[in-house]
């Protein structure tokens, strides 16, 4: 079964050494989640031809996946530590409903999907501790999330496969941008 960072012997150094610092934990968690996404993408691509599909735009119109934009202050030009951290946390909170949707979408990688979801929750907690400006972080409405989940699950098979592919791809891009940005913090 997948093991969260900090739980296996490789991540917990010998008892006499210091525990992971906040930035080490965050870095390790993001890289762990990215590894999990790679495994899930592998199953998705093997199962369907979505990874080569040119019809992504069709499905993308129905999704409102979090994306980094210039105004979020996470890119090299116009980088802003505070604004960017708020965007990363807000984006991860918005991704949670999509990660919930992924839970029933995998057969051989079911545990991996759960581990990605759980590790993302832990990552959000670490980042919230780091953030000074918590007031600026908006949490998605539970009712909105519930109706979005219902809507996504009601799609036909092709759209569900495409949605799964797009969620994984977008989440990977979001995390990669976050990782780069967090390394300047």
């Amino acid at each position: 079964a997948p093991v969260l960072p900090g739980e296996d012997s490789k991540d917990v150094a010998a008892p006499h050494s210091q525990p992971l610092t906040s930035s080490e934990r965050i870095d390790k968690h993001i890289r762990y989640i990215l590894d999990g996404i790679s495994a899930l993408r592998k199953e998705t691509c093997n199962r369907s031809n979505m990874c080569e599909s040119s019809k992504e735009a069709l499905a993308e119109n129905n999704l409102n996946l979090p994306k980094m934009a210039e105004k979020d202050g996470c890119f090299q030009s116009g980088f802003n530590e505070d604004t960017c951290l708020v965007k990363i946390i807000t984006g991860l909170l918005e991704f949670e409903v999509y990660l919930e949707y992924l839970q029933n979408r995998f057969e051989s990688s079911e545990e991996q999907a759960r581990a990605v979801q759980m590790s993302t929750k832990v990552l959000i907690q670490f980042l919230q501790k780091k953030a000074k400006n918590l007031d600026a972080i908006t949490t998605p409405e539970p009712t909105t999330n519930a109706s979005l989940l219902t809507k996504l699950q009601a799609q036909n098979q092709w759209l569900q496969d495409m949605t799964t592919h797009l969620i994984l791809r977008s989440f990977k891009e979001f995390l990669q941008s976050s990782l780069r940005a967090l390394r300047q913090m």
Epitope: A13, S17, Q18, L20, T21, S23, E24, D27, Q76, S77, G78, F79, N80, E81, D82, K132, L179, R180, A181, R183, Q184, M185
Partner: antibody, heavy 120, light 111 residues
Framework: EVQLVESGGGLVQPGGSLRLSCAAS????????MSWVRQAPGKGLEWVSR????????YYADSVKGRFTISRDNAKNTLYLQMNSLKPEDTAVYYC?????????????WGQGTQVTVSS | QSVLTQPPSVSGSPGKTVTISCAGT?????????VSWYQQLPGMAPKLLIY???KRASGIADRFSGSKFANTASLTISGLQSEDEADYYC??????????FGGGTKLTVLG
């Protein structure tokens, strides 16, 4: 063209203080974490301190913790190192360095350095 | 003293290949892919050659390459040229939000 120009070095007595400055130009200073690295005469390099792009997080080598303070003024594109309780072993050339974007702890641009001598 | 161990000196003839090692521990070199290498010409500031173990910095010739196995990193310079004569330093992230350098290696190009 990226430029980092250090100033403020000089001769100081043990127990004294100095404030180093580093004027940055040719890049968006506020987008980068910055650091100070020193090199004692005829010796190797030693990492001293790091500050995050917005100045929120600071990190120090054990050898300077509690004596040195790193800070930055993004409006002035300037990095600082306030050095108190100086010791003879702090004698070195102090380099202002920029962290490579999105990379964990690699320094892609260095200033020419400013000499700090601690002696009575 | 330096935390990472490098040979004080290495030498090689023009056109040949030299490798400089950088030995650390599981808390620094072995912790992640966070090793970088720097070249310092006499009287100059250091210059980034390699970062993230094996990625070349912008404008660096492909004669320079980096690698890592367990707690030891290596810099390999092939097709040695007289202008490569310099001091070379490895650096690594160290557990606890620190950075550490090696003691430096003086490269002499013979002939």
């Amino acid at each position: 063209e990226v430029q980092l120009v250090e100033s403020g070095g000089g001769l100081v007595q043990p127990g004294g203080s100095l404030r180093l400055s580093c004027a940055a130009s040719g890049f968006t200073f506020s987008s980068y974490a910055m650091s100070w690295v020193r090199q004692a005469p005829g010796k190797g390099l030693e990492w001293v301190s790091r500050i995050s792009s917005g100045g929120i997080s600071t990190y120090y080598a054990d050898s300077v913790k509690g004596r040195f303070t790193i800070s930055r003024d993004n409006a002035k594109n300037t990095l600082y190192l306030q050095m108190n309780s100086l010791k003879p072993e702090d004698t070195a050339v102090y380099y202002c360095v920029r962290y490579a974007w999105g990379v964990q702890w690699a320094f892609d641009f260095w200033g020419q350095g400013t000499q700090v001598t601690v002696s009575s | 003293q330096s935390v990472l161990t490098q040979p004080p000196s290495v030498s090689g003839s023009p056109g040949k290949t030299v490798t400089i090692s950088c030995a650390g521990t599981s808390s620094d070199v072995g912790y992640g892919n966070y090793v970088s290498w720097y070249q310092q010409l006499p009287g100059m500031a250091p210059k980034l050659l390699i970062y993230d173990v094996n990625k070349r910095a912008s404008g660096i010739a492909d004669r320079f390459s980096g690698s890592k196995f367990a707690n030891t990193a290596s810099l390999t310079i092939s097709g040695l040229q007289s202008e490569d004569e310099a001091d070379y330093y490895c650096a690594s992230y160290k557990r606890g939000d620190n950075a550490v350098f090696g003691g430096g290696t003086k490269l002499t190009v013979l002939g």
